[in-house]
Interface confidence: medium
């Protein structure tokens, strides 16, 4: 089959843009750390990089291969208000590199960490 | 309370970066359109803008207020392979503006669309 080169270029561009790589995402601080329901953060979210995008095959998953940690200062508010908003510094995982890994490898990796 | 102004600025900057706005995301084409399990797309994902980020309150949700449509050409593969990959042009919703809306309003909006 003969394909229009413009179509091939645009498809290639789509591959590029959707590849598995660190992407800027908004993380809900409370959900990330499973804090008490009476504790709130302002802002409620922080911006970090996490692996995301698509892999070429169903059996692959976009996973982080290296991680740094970012310290961010937020206001913590505990209800009922015993005091005003308190600045707290929290460390967030920031994915610095990613790879499409087989889901089986991911499963093994996670379970080996749990077993330690 | 006395606050370090550098902290106040960095907190404000976090609000800015996590605000509800159109964000570039990867959409799984098959999941987006609920296609048959024997149909695959290459690439499997496309890059579009969708509303994302955080709202200031639990009762608010980041929702699109305006949408454009982008046409993207992909290869469609049907198993068993009766023919080679076939170029198909598909239209994807691309969010162009967003707003934090009350979850109640979102619920009403969705249900009014369903009822029509």
């Amino acid at each position: 089959a003969h394909y229009n080169t413009e179509i091939l270029k645009s498809i290639d561009n789509e591959w590029r843009k959707t590849q598995c790589m660190p992407r800027e995402v908004c993380i809900d601080v409370g959900k990330e750390f499973g804090v008490a329901t009476n504790t709130f953060f302002k802002p409620p979210c922080v911006s970090v990089y996490r692996c995301g995008g698509c892999c070429n095959s169903e059996g692959l998953q976009c996973m982080n291969t290296s991680t740094s940690y970012l310290s961010k200062t937020l206001f913590e508010i505990t209800v009922p208000l015993s005091q005003g908003p308190k600045p707290v510094t929290i460390s967030f995982a920031n994915h610095t590199s990613c790879r499409c890994m087989s889901k089986l490898d991911v499963y093994r990796q996670v379970h080996s960490i749990i077993r330690r | 309370a006395h606050y370090n102004t550098e902290i106040l600025k960095s907190i404000d900057n976090e609000w800015r970066k996590t605000q509800c706005m159109p964000r570039e995301v990867c959409i799984d084409v098959g999941k987006e359109f609920g296609v048959a399990t024997n149909t695959f797309f290459k690439p499997p994902c496309v890059s579009v803008y969708r509303c994302g980020g955080c709202c200031n309150s639990e009762g608010l949700q980041c929702m699109n207020t305006s949408t454009s449509y982008l046409s993207k050409t992909l290869f469609e593969i049907t198993v068993p392979l009766s023919q080679g990959p076939k170029p198909v042009t598909i239209s994807f919703a691309n969010h162009t503006s967003c707003r934090c809306m009350s979850k109640l309003d979102v619920y009403r909006q969705v249900h009014s669309i369903i009822r029509r």
């Epitope: 802002p43 | 309370a1 006395h2 606050y3 370090n4 102004t5 550098e6 106040l8 600025k9 907190i11 404000d12 900057n13 609000w15 800015r16 200031n56």
Partner: antibody, heavy 122, light 107 residues
């Protein structure tokens, strides 16, 4: 050209109220913090309050806390200072001032309005 | 609150003179100090921010230095338009506080 224009000053009796406005133009209003700074006749400068029009965060000097409220209307590019329970010591020229840039580490006021005089007297 | 103490409170100088104004903070404020110039009946103008950075459009004869608690504003060669009151301001913590001012007069 960046401009800040205050209005709403005047003579008010002790215990009275007044609302000052600061109309901003020539820059993206949500990109900068907006401060109110006052200067009593023949005296030095005193910071009053600040707002981030972007997030709505506000901070006040202890001398005005509970009596003054700073707010911003991003659709009008205007900041306000609602002053209640006014006292003689609140008499001053009130300036609104723009913070230099949200990316700078610390507050520094790069543009100021012309000021509006508030006189609290019976 | 952090106190900012300026000295001198006033000084007389001639055109061409080198003028130095100092400001002392009651506690460490890192480099979070700005300097302003104010003329009678006018709003203050920003000269220096973050202790030593010259604000855009400000003549290079103005310079700032210092960190921690001691800060200096220097005018290398005083010009006729420089006769005014100068204020230092810390913004390390809320509330930002100003010095009491230094009035530079013609000798």
């Amino acid at each position: 050209e960046v401009q800040l224009v205050e209005s709403g000053g005047g003579l008010v009796q002790p215990g009275g109220s007044l609302r000052l406005s600061c109309a901003a133009s020539g820059f993206t209003f949500t990109d900068n913090w907006i401060h109110w700074v006052r200067q009593a006749p023949g005296k030095g400068l005193e910071w009053v309050a600040v707002i981030s029009p972007y997030s709505g965060a506000t901070y006040y000097a202890d001398s005005v806390k509970g009596r003054f409220t700073i707010s911003a209307d991003t659709s009008k590019n205007t900041a306000y200072l609602q002053m209640n329970s006014l006292r003689a010591e609140d008499t001053a020229v009130y300036y609104c001032a723009r913070d230099a840039d949200y990316k700078y580490a610390f507050w520094a006021f790069d543009y100021w309005g012309q000021g509006t005089l508030v006189t609290v007297s019976s | 609150d952090i106190q900012m103490t300026q000295s001198p409170s006033s000084l007389s100088a001639s055109v061409g003179d080198r003028v130095t104004i100092t400001c002392r903070a009651s506690q460490d404020v890192s480099t979070a100090v700005a300097w302003y110039q104010q003329k009678p009946g006018k709003a203050p103008k920003l000269l220096i921010y973050s202790a030593s950075f010259l604000y855009s459009g400000v003549p290079s004869r103005f310079s700032g230095s210092g960190s921690g608690t001691d800060f200096t504003l220097t005018i290398s060669s005083l010009q006729p338009e420089d006769f005014a009151t100068y204020y230092c301001q810390q913004s390390y913590t809320t509330p930002p506080t100003f010095g009491q001012g230094t009035k530079v007069e013609i000798k």
